[in-house]
């Protein structure tokens, strides 16, 4: 025998108080699948959260974070404070990157400047708190009589040492 509730579509629930007829979800609730015996309460995006997508009878609301914060976790379960470029979030709030490190985003940690000399190159543009150094040609390439065009260095994936 087929369950009469299986005929109730998304956006409704099977109302046991009314002979199992399909009733629409009440305001501020939803059912995303058919055959539901209850509707779920819509998520409310308040405080540090703001509404990215309104709740409908068939889908929950979706939140993101208010300005000055960014989402953490699936479905934006929490919000983390933004910092300025050139800073990182510490236990005591946003702090400037130490000398020799940079952060070009509003989140994440300060990372060390690239060490150009490891690739046999010279520093073309100095690093700042917000920007990495720019490496230029190797010192040998700048010596008198050296060719002005140098072949590109072989591409290397981050985290992989050269073969």
């Amino acid at each position: 025998l087929q369950d009469p509730c299986s005929n109730c579509p998304a956006g409704t629930f099977c109302d046991n108080n009314r002979n199992q007829i399909c009733s629409p979800c009440p305001p501020n609730s939803f059912s995303s699948a058919g055959g539901q015996r209850t509707c779920d309460i819509c998520r409310q995006c308040k405080g540090v959260f703001r509404t990215r997508k309104e709740c409908s009878s068939t889908s929950n609301a979706e939140c993101d974070c208010t300005p000055g914060f960014h989402c953490l976790g699936a479905g934006c379960s929490m919000c983390e404070q933004d910092c300025k470029q050139g800073q990182e979030l510490t236990k005591k709030g946003c702090k400037d990157c130490c000398f020799g490190t940079f952060n070009d985003q509003k989140r994440g940690i300060c990372r060390p400047w690239t060490n150009c000399s490891l690739d046999g190159k010279s520093v073309l543009v100095n690093g700042t708190k917000e920007r990495d150094v720019v490496c230029g040609p190797s010192p040998a390439d700048l010596s008198p009589g050296a060719s002005s065009v140098t072949p590109p260095a072989p591409a290397r994936e981050p985290g992989h040492s050269p073969q």
Partner: nanobody, 128 residues
Framework: EVQLVESGGGLVQPGGSLRLSCAAS????????MGWVRQAPGKGREFVSA????????YYADSVKGRFTISRDNSKNTLYLQMNSLRAEDTAVYYC?????????????????????WGQGTQVTVSS
């Protein structure tokens, strides 16, 4: 047994200051995000402020921004709310709340369903 015990409430004149404390026990305090929530007579709950487990991220409701400061001392398992320039509309019962999740060391939440534990509250009355 988990306990959150608020203290520091009382009667204060408009423009005055109070410092609320919330002493926590029975759980790993530093891995929990914490929040202060208030409820005025006949009104709904309002999230006043929240702080991440490490203390790096802080949130303030617009109504208290620039006047209230949230902080925590993980070595003392205590949450604080420094309230300055108090107004009559700050009169309410103030509750502290603790919630744990994958990102609670770094993030904050103002969703009441996130918080696992709630204190009994402390009354703050601002009146001349």
């Amino acid at each position: 047994e988990v306990q959150l015990v608020e203290s520091g409430g009382g009667l204060v004149q408009p423009g005055g200051s109070l410092r609320l404390s919330c002493a926590a026990s029975g759980f790993t305090f530093s891995s929990y995000a914490m929040g202060w929530v208030r409820q005025a007579p006949g009104k709904g709950r309002e999230f006043v402020s929240a702080i991440s487990g490490y203390g790096g991220s802080t949130y303030y409701a617009d109504s208290v921004k620039g006047r209230f400061t949230i902080s925590r001392d993980n070595s003392k398992n205590t949450l604080y709310l420094q309230m300055n320039s108090l107004r009559a509309e700050d009169t309410a019962v103030y509750y502290c709340a603790a919630g744990s999740g994958l990102y609670s060391s770094y993030g904050v939440s103002t969703d009441p369903s996130f918080y696992d534990y709630w204190g009994q509250g402390t009354q703050v009355t601002v009146s001349s």
